[in-house]
Amino acid sequence: AVFDIHVVYVTTTEMWLDWKSPDGASEYVYHLVIESKHGSNHTSTYDKAITLQGLIPGTLYNITISPEVDHVWGDPNSTAQYTRPSNVSNIDVSTNTTAATLSWQNFDDASPTYSYCLLIEKAGNSSNATQVVTDIGITDATVTELIPGSSYTVEIFAQVGDGIKSLEPGRKSFCTDPASMASFDCEVVPKEPALVLKWTCPPGANAGFELEVSSGAWNNATHLESCSSENGTEYRTEVTYLNFSTSYNISITTVSCGKMAAPTRNTCTTGITDPPPPDGSPNITSVSHNSVKVKFSGFEASHGPIKAYAVILTTGEAGHPSADVLKYTYEDFKKGASDTYVTYLIRTEEKGRSQSLSEVLKYEIDVGNESTTLGYYNGKLEPLGSYRACVAGFTNITFHPQNKGLIDGAESYVSFSRYSDAVSLPQDPGVICG
């Protein structure tokens, strides 16, 4: 009899068998019948081992071994063994942020009887591989719960029968798609032509971000460093060298593994600052013994729309005015508390029209006509007085909360023209005639 038939190794087309027989008689001939669904064939050997060749991959073979000595046949013994399936090939992967759909091919005749074992391993984390086994004959699988923007390796073994696997797996590296940034916020930087962008890191891994800033024909593309989504930190970057009070289209794209996510877009407007001081000074002309006419051009709106103008008069030295003068009124002047005061306030938005950057408006103010604008009284001027005029332009005008109607110079965004040349008022004609 033959016993302990042992399959030493098996490949796709070969099988090496050995066995034992009860006595050591060397004159035994062993007859083998090799049967599969493709048919059967016979072979003999004097050895207690044989290598069967030319087999078909993934096929179940029944091997019956019968000993014979001097034409006397002993009891046969059998074993059943599959050859290994061929390795899978042509692995194709399509991904989204958290899943990968894999498909592959196996060209064996027996492939309709194969199932496939997939091992999915995140790069640098071999201890935590995911295993998926397909149904018989299925050559695709979707793996879910993956991490966005991350690198994975998949190994695919074909298997048949009771877990007889292909010798080598088909291997493929792939990356999941990076996750887009959910959104980002823009903050203006006070008195700076800049924007601060803030975001929380998108889930998964990233190599960095592409930042695109665009306004009209101007654009700028730059890279941003990578971030980590693990601790929910808020990330920020400052975009500088912009223009004041300008709308910008901003796009941020996550990058990982050489892949780019869908861009996240926002439209943001930069802040304002003090207007650029005008080159010229106002034009002042005497109208009567107690009034003058002040003419000036609107300030340039490149640092933000001009919200208001204040006409300032002084009888003193014409130094460069500061925001401090904005607190003085006609009453202060009359009391001798200041030789400089605000006589008139113009709120430009009351004109009901927007001013473009290049459009320069002309203003003509009658000073001394006893009108009142907010907390400022446009009182009569002193006959024979010598007056100079200056104009303050505001991109942001703030009023004292406790001093109703008076400008808070420190909190406002303001710049000043130079003082005009002095104009001397004539004598009051009533005094001459008197």
């Epitope: 190599a207 592409e210 665009s214 654009n219 593309a221 890279h223 289209n249 796009s251 990058v255 780019m260």
Partner: antibody
């Protein structure tokens, strides 16, 4: 699998125009920054032009500025390079490429442009 | 423009040897450096981006290092298929610029 296929190259006289195309497949074309890179015969590589994904902003090397125009049609997943006023020094194989974070990741097979009278 | 100086211009190595190619940027480029391999008549292929991450499918015998202005590409256990021209490239600032290339041959 990312696939980029350039076309439109050929022999052209100096001063004339040529339009190259790059058909993209296997990825979401509209998400990607794209570029053209060229290589003169037996020479090194030279970046030519670049276009962003968000607002289609464009950038060019100085020697082609004003003569070349990069554009994209996201609906057709196609990148273009319009080359006007061609010069003999523009003779090269032109490749299109995806460009995340300044690295030319995926390349086409290239199309040869020969500028000669 | 940022100049990328690659050394050596050419080198030959025997099977199994380790080779190094250096790249020097004329100004700091953070880690925005990529390495490419080009074989005759073929398109360049990305090997390494952002100074050290290996691109998908590139054998692990390739490695990159460096940041700022000095970078290097190391190929351990030289194989016949590693023959070709290697280029470094900065993607930090326009115009993006390449090194002149290093021709690697098998001895």
């Amino acid at each position: 699998e990312v696939k980029l296929v350039e076309s439109g190259g050929g022999l052209v006289q100096p001063g004339r125009s040529l339009k190259l195309s790059c058909a993209a497949s296997g990825f979401t074309f509209s998400n990607y920054y794209m570029a053209w890179v060229r290589q003169a015969p037996t020479k090194g590589l030279e970046w030519v032009a670049y276009i962003t994904n968000g607002f289609g902003s464009t950038y060019y090397r100085d020697s082609v500025k004003g003569r070349f125009t990069i554009s994209r049609d996201n609906a057709k997943s196609t990148l273009y390079l319009q080359m006007d006023s061609l010069r003999s020094e523009d003779t090269a194989t032109y490749y299109c490429s995806t460009v995340p974070l300044g690295a030319f990741v995926s390349w086409g097979q290239g199309t040869l442009v020969t500028v000669s009278s | 423009d940022i100049q990328m100086t690659q050394t050596p211009h050419s080198l030959s190595a025997s099977l199994g040897e380790t080779v190094s190619i250096e790249c020097l940027a004329s100004e700091g480029i953070s880690n925005y450096l990529a390495w490419y391999q080009q074989k005759p008549g073929k398109s360049p292929q990305l090997l390494i981006s952002y100074a050290n991450p290996l691109h998908d499918g590139v054998p692990s015998r390739f490695s990159g290092s460096g940041s700022g202005t000095q970078f290097s590409l190391k190929i351990r256990n030289m194989q016949p298929e590693d023959e070709g021209v290697y280029y470094c490239q900065q993607g930090y600032k326009f115009p993006y610029t390449f090194g002149a290339g290093t021709k690697l041959e098998l001895t």
